[in-house]
């Protein structure tokens, strides 16, 4: 017998979609061999309709796909826009069609529900609203109007025009009688439940001359949309529940065992601890739609998710809902990178951020996740030369090492830098990744003086002491600016005396600035790297002042000047409040973002989720001096 398994019979109706899962033993050969879905002909044979090697028959063009899940030993065939012509016998299988590794599936597509013997069919989604229209004749205009539900053999009164409401419908039903011109009354039922489904009878009048109309109410549980995303990648759930719930609390929950649906995030401020640092709920549109982004996908994130609206911010009977079944593909295209990076206070971290290597020209971004409200991620730096003002001199985004990875360096670490950061681009939205920075106890490895004052026209020498642990690393000095850190010539001055228990392999490397000018003012970094991979860095601010006395300055670790307490704005620069703009990359249609910078005032978009609070001034050039 064949080891392939699947549904023997699939029954659906015209216009629907089906998702057919075929199971196979997950041996390494099976995992990587061709998967196919074919239709059996009258004379034997099986005509391929779709395969894992990219073939799609013209019959299926634009309405079918086949996705392999090698780690589960399954593949799924999705077919949309079914018609009765799709009814027939099929095979799902592995290898070549004529070989025995297959499973027979019978697909039967029947005609959709229509009007049967004067019964009006209403097909409505769970949690939504239905309006049942009931016509009547003039002679019954003044008589009692009522709606009954057929329960078994007996009609049970649901509502009538004298004010009766069946307890099962309290607070969610009303009977409207149209103006005198129209001989029609309507019954509106909100927050539809599955138990509301069934046969209804509306009636005007109570005698033998009464007008009657049958209605068949079908309440559909939403079909889960199948979503396949890569491990470590990102998923966006777009939830459109309709304008009638625009002002009701929204939620996303994940079904656990049984009936429970555990809240992942809601608009009342609840967020599941497992999603801390890697989830954003974007602000609602006027039509009540919203979306939720989850990054850093884990194997255990797979499952069924429901979004909905209810005043409690969680799933309740009658909540309008949308459903997804999320599969997390463990054979991910997104490379492993550390999810936690530890840095010592006063020192630095170098974070490697993956991106889709096909999009090397995309703009790279780094943002800081904030848990306030529904989560937001204000941008800190990008690859086009923008750095948030508070991070000047200590944050740099480098395109190196390239080929699918960029680097973010943050130095002068303090406990306030602990938190979750997102790497993203304006290209493939699935490649958003999350890293947590933790600040730990310890001493920085690199030793540099505190901030330094240079004198115009003179020479300045700034030392950087490297311990022996970095003996095999390349050591460098560079001058920080918004676009990166430009390498500068430096001198190896031999072993350093700044370290106890450190042999000849320690190093003192100096930066020399000859004939200092105003342009030399700014931040300088010394650091270590191996090829294109960056390690620890240390930063020094060099201020430039008028000559007081002749001579050159050689700065030691002890005699550096203290840093000024505040930055002073250049008189020519107008600091304009930075508006927090909804970032189109994280939400909306997920389209590639246009550059949202306003060149005139230096304001800047933030990856925001609902707040329009000020975002500190932004910087494209050096606006500040000391």
């Amino acid at each position: 017998k064949s080891p392939i398994f699947g549904p023997e019979e699939v029954n659906s109706v015209e216009g629907n979609s089906v998702s057919i899962t075929c199971y196979y033993p997950p041996t390494s050969v099976n995992r990587h061999t061709r998967k196919y879905w074919c239709r059996q002909g009258a004379r034997g044979g099986c005509i391929t309709l779709i395969s894992s090697e990219g073939y799609v028959s013209s019959k299926y063009a634009g309405r079918a796909n086949l996705t392999n899940f090698p780690e589960n030993g399954t593949f799924v065939v999705n077919i949309a826009q079914l018609s009765q012509d799709d009814s027939g016998r099929y095979k799902c299988g592995l290898g070549i069609n004529s070989r025995g590794l297959s499973f027979d599936v019978s697909l039967e597509v029947s005609q959709g529900p229509g009007l049967l013997n004067d019964t009006k069919v209403y097909t409505v989604d769970l949690g939504r609203t239905v309006t049942i229209n009931c016509p009547f004749k003039t002679e019954n205009a003044q008589k009692r109007k009522s709606l009954y539900k057929q329960i078994g053999l007996y009609p049970v009164l649901v509502i009538d025009s004298s004010g009766y409401v069946n307890p099962n419908y309290t607070g969610r039903i009303r009977l409207d009688i149209q103006g005198t011109g129209q001989l029609l009354f309507s019954v509106v039922i909100n927050q539809l439940r599955l138990s509301d489904a069934g046969q209804y009878l509306c009636q005007a009048g109570d005698d033998s001359n009464s007008n009657k109309k049958n209605a068949d109410l079908q309440v559909l549980k939403p079909e889960p949309e199948l979503v396949y995303e890569d491990l470590r990648g990102s998923v966006t759930f777009h939830c459109a529940l309709g304008p009638e719930v625009a002002n009701v609390a929204k939620f996303l929950c994940r079904q656990s065992s049984g009936e429970n649906c555990d809240v992942v995030v809601n608009t009342l401020g609840k967020r599941a601890p497992a999603f801390e640092g890697r989830i954003l709920l974007n602000p609602q549109d006027k039509d009540g739609s919203f979306s939720v982004v989850i990054t850093g996908l884990r194997k255990e994130d797979a499952g069924r998710y429901l979004c909905g609206a209810h005043s409690d911010g969680q799933l309740q009977e009658g909540s309008p809902i949308q459903a997804w079944q999320l599969f997390v593909n463990e054979e991910s295209t997104i490379p492993r990178s550390p999810t936690v990076v530890k840095g010592v206070a006063g020192s630095s971290v170098a974070v490697l951020c993956p991106y889709n290597r096909k999009e090397s020209k995309s703009i790279k971004y780094w943002c800081l996740w904030e848990g306030a409200q529904n989560g937001r991620c204000p941008l800190l730096v990008d690859s086009e030369g923008w750095v948030k003002a508070q991070y000047e001199g200590r944050l740099s985004l480098l395109e190196e090492p390239g080929n699918g990875t960029f680097t973010v360096i943050l130095n002068q670490l303090t406990s306030r830098d602990a938190g979750f950061y997102w790497c993203l681009t304006n290209g493939d939205t699935l490649w958003r990744t999350t890293v947590e920075i933790k600040i730990i106890e310890g001493e920085p490895n690199l030793k540099v003086p505190g901030n330094v004052t240079a004198v115009l026209g003179e020479t300045l020498k700034v030392p950087c002491h490297f311990p022996c642990k970095f003996s095999s690393y390349e050591k460098y000095w560079c001058k920080w600016n918004n676009t990166g850190c430009q390498a500068l010539p430096s001198q190896d001055e031999g072993p350093s005396k700044a370290f106890v228990n450190c042999d000849e392999n320690s190093r003192l490397v100096s930066l020399t600035l000859n004939l200092v000018t105003r342009a030399d003012e700014g931040w300088y970094w010394c650091g270590v790297k191996q090829g294109h991979f960056y390690g620890e860095t240390a930063a020094v601010y060099v201020a430039v002042e008028e000559r007081k006395a002749a001579g050159s300055r050689d700065v030691s670790l002890a005699k550096a000047d203290a840093a000024p307490d505040e930055k002073v704005l250049d008189s020519g620069f107008r600091e304009i409040e930075n508006k927090a703009i909804q970032d189109p990359r994280l939400f909306a249609e997920e389209k590639a973002v246009a550059d949202t910078r306003d060149q005139a005032d230096g304001s800047r978009a933030s990856v925001d989720s609902g707040s329009s609070e000020e975002q500190g001034g932004s910087s494209r050039h050096h606006h500040h001096h000391h």
């Epitope: 398994f5 549904p7 023997e8 019979e9 699939v10 029954n11 659906s12 109706v13 629907n16 979609s17 089906v18 998702s19 057919i20 199971y23 589960n72 399954t74 769970l126 439940r193 599955l194 559909l220 549980k221 939403p222 079909e223 889960p224 079904q255 065992s257 049984g258 009936e259 649906c261 499952g303 069924r304 009977e317 079944q325």
Partner: nanobody
Framework: QVQLVESGGGLVQAGDSLRLSCAAS????????MGWFRQAPGKEREFVTT??????????YYADSVKGRFTISRDNAKNTVYLQMNSLKPDDTAVYYC?????????????????WGQGTQVTVSS
């Protein structure tokens, strides 16, 4: 919680038919699939058949040993699943359990099911 109650078991002759019912009550709104497993004395619980649904689409799965003889169906309005068993054999003797699931990755695996009935005995004599 979802409660499942099986009925219809009994003693029949080989070649006869039997129809089992499984009525679900309670919070059935997120139930995604219902099926039948069986357990003969001294043996492990084994998959028989399952029906899963999504909107107005039904998917029916059968074990090789019952293909062509057993049929699963459901009455959505009554929250009931039926198992029609034809051409019964002595090997079909077992306690038949109804099971329901909210999320089903593989219908053949008992641990994928969240709710179970108490079981109904089916005995097929030769």
């Amino acid at each position: 919680q979802v409660q499942l109650v099986e009925s219809g078991g009994g003693l029949v002759q080989a070649g006869d038919s039997l129809r089992l019912s499984c009525a679900a009550s309670g919070r059935t709104r997120t139930t995604y699939g219902m099926g039948w497993f069986r357990q003969a004395p001294g043996k492990e619980r084994e998959f028989v058949t399952t029906i899963t649904w999504s909107g107005s689409t039904n998917y029916k799965y059968y074990a090789d040993s019952v293909k062509g003889r057993f049929t699963i169906s459901r009455d959505n309005a009554k929250n009931t699943v039926y198992l029609q068993m034809n051409s019964l054999k002595p090997d079909d003797t077992a306690v038949y359990y109804c099971a329901a699931s909210t999320v089903l990755t593989d219908p053949r695996v008992p641990t994928e099911y969240d709710y179970w009935g108490q079981g109904t005995q089916v005995t097929v004599s030769s």
